[in-house]
């Protein structure tokens, strides 16, 4: 049953909002999709979760949520925010999740984000962000997840990422990025997932992924690459790689030599004509390999060390004979 304290909590519930105890004697407040144009004023100091998404909030005043020192998650997605002032999140010492997606922000709200030392997840996707200031994430030492997809970025904000050594997942998909320079993610040694799909990437620095020592998932699908991304060779923990729907014509010898942990490679919808015979060697975790329309392949690929394939598809190639060892190489 509810304790006397939970009754006190629920009396601090703003009009029309839905409130419930969170099990720790704090309050979850859902004020989403109510047509609000400003923040509710009578919030309980014991609020741990506040959902203000899908409203008509167009501006935040400095210090609009005073005394919410227990607030851990703040959702402001789907509003009409164009700017967030300095001090908008002052006093939110416990804030771990901040959702600002689907607004009309043009810049990362640098000053407002300062000193959110507990922040672990930041959603800035689906805005109009074209510029990420160099120091905008400098105080976010706990940040684990960062969404910057579906914005208007034309380049990787290299300097801004330097302070995010704890980051584990990031998406920069659905932007207008055209090039990834050397050491673009050089300090992101904890990053496990990186999404770069649906950009305009046509060139990669030879060392653009250097420093990503924990990376397991890399998504380069739907870009304009016309050469195989050899920069992946430093990604020794890579498990899932996507570069389908690009303009890559060949996969070189020893293509995945630095990626022995690969389980999945998606590279369909590329005009691949040539595949180096040694390209898929020493991939013991690889389960599926599909090579369609590689017309310049004349020899069956050497699958030495790639012993756990469950599915191999080769169409449109010029292979005239199979090596005697092919049945030994496959399970």
């Amino acid at each position: 049953g509810s304790s006397p304290r939970s009754g006190v909590l629920l009396r601090g519930c703003p009009t029309h909002c839905h409130c419930e105890p969170d099990g720790r004697m704090l309050l979850r407040v859902d004020c989403s999709d109510l047509g609000l144009s400003e923040l509710p004023s009578n919030l309980s100091v014991f609020t741990s979760y506040l959902d203000l998404s899908m409203n008509n909030i167009s501006q935040l005043l400095p210090n609009p949520l005073p005394s919410l020192r227990f607030l851990e998650e703040l959702r402001l997605a789907g509003n009409a925010l164009t700017y967030i002032p300095k001090g908008a999140f002052t006093g939110l010492y416990s804030l771990k999740v901040l959702m600002l997606q689907n607004n009309q922000l043009r810049h990362v709200p640098t000053e407002a984000l300062q000193n959110l030392r507990s922040l672990q997840s930041l959603r800035l996707d689906a805005n109009h962000i074209s510029y990420v200031p160099p120091s905008c994430f400098s105080g976010l030492h706990s940040l684990r997840h960062l969404w910057l997809d579906d914005n208007a970025l034309t380049e990787i904000p290299v300097q801004a990422f330097r302070s995010l050594s704890a980051l584990q997942a990031m998406t920069l998909a659905l932007n207008k990025i055209h090039h990834i320079p050397d050491y673009a993610f050089g300090n992101l040694s904890s990053l496990v997932v990186l999404h770069l799909h649906n950009n305009r990437i046509h060139s990669l620095g030879k060392k653009c992924f250097d420093g990503l020592h924990s990376l397991e998932t890399l998504d380069l699908n739907y870009n304009n690459l016309d050469e195989f991304p050899t920069a992946i060779r430093t990604l020794s923990n890579l498990k899932e790689l996507g570069f389908h729907s690009n303009n890559i014509r060949s996969i070189p010898e020893k293509a995945f030599v630095g990626n022995p942990s690969l389980i999945t490679i998606h590279f369909y919808d590329n005009p691949i004509q040539f595949v180096g015979r040694s390209a898929f060697q020493h991939l013991p975790e690889l389960r599926t390999l599909t090579l369609n329309g590689a017309s310049q392949i004349t020899e069956f690929p050497d699958l030495t060390g790639t012993a756990n394939l469950e599915s191999l598809t080769l169409t449109g190639a010029q292979i005239s004979s199979l090596p005697q060892t092919v049945c030994n190489q496959l399970p």
Partner: antibody, heavy 118, light 111 residues
Framework: EVQLVQSGAEVKKPGASVKVSCKAS????????IEWVRQAPGQGLEWIGE????????DYNEKFKVRVTITADTSTSTAYLELSSLRSEDTAVYYC???????????WGQGTLVTVSS | DIVMTQSPDSLAVSLGERATINCRAS??????????MHWYQQKPGQPPKLLIY???NLESGVPDRFSGSGSGTDFTLTISSLQAEDVAVYYC?????????FGQGTKVEIK
């Protein structure tokens, strides 16, 4: 603990070749570039070239390109520098180093003295 | 090639005093906001040791009396309070473009 251990000192005649080795331990060998740098007696440091072990990715200082070959064997985590057509001005300590944070050279071998003398 | 020029060639500083070494590149070594300039310390008979990377970032384990600053073409290494163990030759290095190049070195001694 990251370590780079180089082969011992060499004395060579002019026109000969030398091959210096650099055995790495304490990290994933194929995930970092190995750089080669030399230092003539009493002089400064000069970059020779680099390799990403396991791949065919190498870069050379144009000054050495025709005489230098850098290779690596991932099975033994060892990188090699071979310099041919030796001359007296090649007398130097040759260092291997790991390309670390943003390409800075964060770990170095102890150096290999190559003396070229007739 | 990018030419790195250090000044002065040698420097004598009293214990506890500040030592400042300058390094100038013949062209900018900045790219996407990063300055690809690093500083090393070399003591006699030893390989160089990384002190500072990307112009101003202290390498792990390096005492905080060492600091770096600068961008573009002009960079500075500062030892805020010189200790006896800091006697060495200091080198700057750029890896903005091949061939990577070093300064000629600055010898730091105790006055």
């Amino acid at each position: 603990e990251v370590q780079l251990v180089q082969s011992g000192a060499e004395v060579k005649k002019p026109g000969a070749s030398v091959k210096v080795s650099c055995k790495a331990s304490g990290y994933t060998f194929s995930a970092y570039w190995i750089e080669w740098v030399r230092q003539a007696p009493g002089q400064g440091l000069e970059w020779i070239g680099e390799i990403l072990p396991g791949s065919d990715s190498t870069d050379y200082n144009e000054k050495f390109k025709v005489r230098v070959t850098i290779t690596a064997d991932t099975s033994t985590s060892t990188a090699y520098l071979e310099l041919s057509s030796l001359r007296s001005e090649d007398t130097a300590v040759y260092y291997c180093a790991r390309g670390g944070h943003y390409g800075s050279l964060d770990y170095w071998g102890q150096g290999t003295l190559v003396t070229v003398s007739s | 090639d990018i030419v790195m020029t250090q000044s002065p060639d040698s420097l004598a500083v009293s214990l506890g005093e500040r030592a400042t070494i300058n390094c100038r590149a013949s062209e900018s070594v900045d790219n996407y906001g990063n300055s690809f300039m690093h500083w090393y310390q070399q003591k006699p008979g030893q390989p160089p040791k990384l002190l500072i990377y990307l112009a101003s970032n202290l390498e792990s384990g390096v005492p905080d009396r060492f600091s770096g600053s600068g961008s573009g073409t002009d960079f500075t290494l500062t030892i805020s309070s010189l200790q006896a163990e800091d006697v060495a030759v200091y080198y700057c290095q750029q890896n903005y473009e091949d061939p990577f190049t070093f300064g000629q070195g600055t010898k730091v001694e105790i006055k």
